[in-house]
């Protein structure tokens, strides 16, 4: 039968009853070898039966006296076989054997859960010899049980290479539960259902849970560890933990806190990092997200002019890099510009308005209705034209720039002007007769040149031909006009 | 299904005692807690307490406590509400309700009307 | 100890009609559950937690709220909802319940 120790009961003695060999209580020990030095606690647990060895793991000796008498089976005497005490406390309890002494260099070794215990352990073997035997006593104290001390300790003692085995002394340290699991903090959707998990291990079993939200007990029925808690829903942020009990007492979990996911804040912080004329590159700082994460993000893109029919313009773009640029503006414009993002509940509200400007750009569209005609009395090429409209200059005209192309037998040659933005007509020297002139006009502003217009032909005719029609840019489709004479 | 059947009505005498029970059918049933509701004659609900049928503790409400005494007998699965020194004031219907998480009502007996009459 | 203040104290309304029943507690509770009780009869569980529907009860019945004031609302009166409605608060103890709703045929 195991005999069971409880912390309660009174410290056994050390060493309660003779071996054989009468060892006397006022011996002492020979030899005594110390594993490790520590504090010996005053809480001992030592054998209870030393009379009868146990039928376990024996070594029979072949060596016989000199008058040839075999000698018993040795064996480690009974101990204690359950020791239950709180965590912190201090603990002893030993293996003894009596070892005959004709055998020499005896040792015991201790081993937990199969594994032999080395190193820093309090552990020391006693020895006290008589004229026949030796009792050895091999103690094990450790000072302050954890957990980790829980198990099922033996000792080993090795004799002409038979090894004999104690029987098992359990340890079972108990205190405040533990926790293997804690509640966890989360982000939930208002009003929706969500679960929490505690659980606690002993010893001493059961664990029994409660839960507590808000400083009020859910729970006021405990539940068994394990306990998962099914919360109804939320309207606004929670703090959960739970109890765990046992016969020790109780500990409590971390408290968490349980958020409610609800729709971001607005950005701050937009501010313009680059202007084109056609682009604005905005960057943002983003609000609170509502517990929940970013989803994308909203370019809002007012006209600031008063005289604008307010449309927005609306972009959308990933929530990072907190980075756009905003693209098909128009040039020398002002805008508003604001952001809003958004998360799995919905959008933000716009970010305060900001005022931005696009640059003088070149002018996206070229001069209109470009005419050409050949001035014989002067040997010059009139050239007139609109220019564009306000809205495609992209900014202040400077003026414009003529290209005019030279072509006869094989020779091509070009030539560019540039004259300023004060009327709509420049006059060009012929610079070759009997030659086709190809000529196209762009609008300047200080953003650069715009595109050149559509090509207008003019032959120019060896000296001494009369009356010349003009030549004009085409009506749309038709193709490389060619001034006929 | 979860029920709740209490006792039938009692009519005692001032002074007397009376016992009302309450048998828990469908659910385990010391995985819930057993509260005890009063309702005066034409009036509204009172909260009485609870007893915890897994420790067995009762705990009553400021307005019930010494006369009214919560028991269970675990083995029937029934819990009992005793009063004694009977007051024409304790004429009710009693009722005892399935207590679980939050504070949750969720089954409810029949109720019991104890009147209390000279 | 909580004091719930449930408004009015008789209603009296239609069937197809929308009836809003309203429970005022003196401080914050954490949630709030609905009751409704017919003449002669327990108490039966309508809503629980504030907001959910309890087992069996028809989706007309919902209910709202949060701090200190709550909301039971019938989206369309049926015959057999007119009864005693109250409610009950969970987050100090002692639980306590409203003195009740009376909801008559008009």
């Known amino acids: 039968a195991i005999t069971e120790a409880r912390e309660e009961a009174k410290p056994y003695p050390l060493f309660p009853g003779p071996f054989p060999g009468s060892l006397q209580t006022d011996h002492t020990p020979l030899l005594s070898l110390p594993h490790a030095s520590g504090y010996q606690p005053a809480l001992m647990f030592s054998p209870t039966q030393p009379g009868r060895p146990h039928t376990g793991n024996v070594a029979i000796p072949q060596v016989t006296s000199v008058e040839s008498k075999p000698l018993p089976p040795l064996a480690f005497k009974h101990t204690v076989g359950h020791i239950i005490l709180s965590e912190h406390k201090g603990v002893k309890f030993n293996c003894s054997i009596s070892v005959p002494n004709i055998y020499q260099d005896t040792t015991i070794s201790w081993w937990k859960d199969g594994k032999e215990l080395l190193g820093a352990h309090h552990a020391i073997t006693q020895f006290y010899p008589d004229d026949e035997v030796t009792a050895i006593i091999a103690s094990f104290s450790i000072t302050s049980v954890q957990r980790s001390d829980n198990g099922s300790y033996i000792c080993k003692m090795k004799i002409n290479n038979e090894e004999i085995v104690s029987d098992p002394i359990y340890i079972e340290v108990q205190g405040l539960p533990h926790f293997t699991k804690q509640p966890e903090s989360m982000n939930v959707t208002r009003n929706t259902a969500f679960n929490l998990t505690c659980q606690a291990v002993g010893p001493p079993e059961p664990v029994n849970i409660f839960w507590v939200q808000n400083s009020s007990r859910v729970n006021e029925q405990p539940e068994k560890s394990p306990s998962v808690l099914t919360v109804p829903g939320l309207t606004e942020m929670a703090v959960f933990s739970c109890e765990a009990h046992n016969d020790k007492g109780l500990t409590v979990s971390k408290g968490v806190q349980i958020n409610i996911k609800a729709i971001p804040s607005p950005p701050t912080e937009v501010s313009i990092r680059n202007s084109t004329a056609h682009s604005i590159l905005i960057s943002w700082v983003p609000g609170f997200d509502g517990y929940s994460p970013f989803r994308n993000c909203s370019i809002q893109v007012k006209e600031a002019d008063p005289l604008s029919n307010g449309s927005v313009m609306i972009f959308n773009t990933s929530a990072l890099p907190h980075l756009y640029q905003i693209k098909q503006l128009q040039a020398l414009a002002n805008y508003s510009i604001g952001v809003s993002c958004m998360n799995e509940i919905g959008w933000s509200a716009v970010s305060p308005w900001i005022l931005a400007s696009t640059t003088e750009g070149a002018p996206s569209v070229a001069p209109l209705n470009v005419t050409v005609f050949l001035n014989e009395s002067s040997d010059n090429v009139d050239i007139r034209w609109m220019k564009p409209p306000t809205k495609q200059q992209d900014g202040e005209l400077v003026g414009y720039r003529i290209s005019h192309v030279w072509q006869s037998a094989g020779i091509s040659k070009e030539l560019l002007e540039e004259v300023g933005q004060n009327g709509s007509r420049a006059r060009i020297s012929v610079q070759v007769h009997n030659a086709t002139c190809t000529v196209r006009i762009a609008a300047v502003t200080r953003g650069g040149v715009g595109p050149f217009s559509d090509p207008v032909k003019i032959f120019i005719p060896a000296h001494g031909w009369v009356d010349y029609a003009p030549s004009s840019t085409p009506a749309p489709g038709n193709a490389d006009p060619v001034l006929i004479i | 299904q979860v029920q709740l059947v209490q006792s039938g009505s009692e009519l005692k005498k001032p002074g007397a005692s009376v016992k009302v029970s309450c048998k828990a059918s469908g659910y385990i049933f010391t995985s819930y807690g057993l509260s005890w509701v009063r309702q005066a004659p034409g009036q509204g609900l009172e909260w009485m307490g609870w007893?915890?049928?897994?420790?067995?503790?009762?705990t009553y409400t400021d307005d019930f406590k010494g006369r009214f005494v919560f028991s269970l007998d675990t083995s029937v699965s029934t819990a009992y509400l005793q009063i004694s020194s009977l007051k024409a004031e304790d004429t009710a219907v009693y009722y005892c309700?399935?207590?679980?998480?939050?504070?949750?009502?969720?089954?409810w007996g029949q109720g019991t009307l104890v009147t209390v009459s000279s | 100890e909580i004091v719930l203040t449930q408004s009015p104290a008789t209603l009296s309304l239609s069937p197809g009609e929308r009836a809003t029943l309203s429970c005022r507690a003196s401080?914050?509770?954490?949630?709030m559950h609905w009751y409704q009780q017919k003449p002669g009869q327990a108490p039966r569980l309508l809503i629980y937690a504030t907001s959910n529907l309890a087992s069996g009860i028809p989706a007309r019945f919902s209910g709202s709220g949060s701090g200190t004031d709550f909301t039971l609302t019938i989206s369309r009166l049926e015959p057999e909802d007119f009864a005693v409605y109250y409610c009950q608060q969970w987050g100090s103890l002692p639980f306590t319940f409203g003195g009740g709703t009376k909801l008559e045929i008009k």
């Open positions: 007893v915890n049928t897994y420790s067995g503790v009762p």
């Open positions: 309700a399935r207590y679980t998480n939050y504070g949750v009502f969720d089954y």
């Open positions: 401080s914050t509770v954490g949630y």
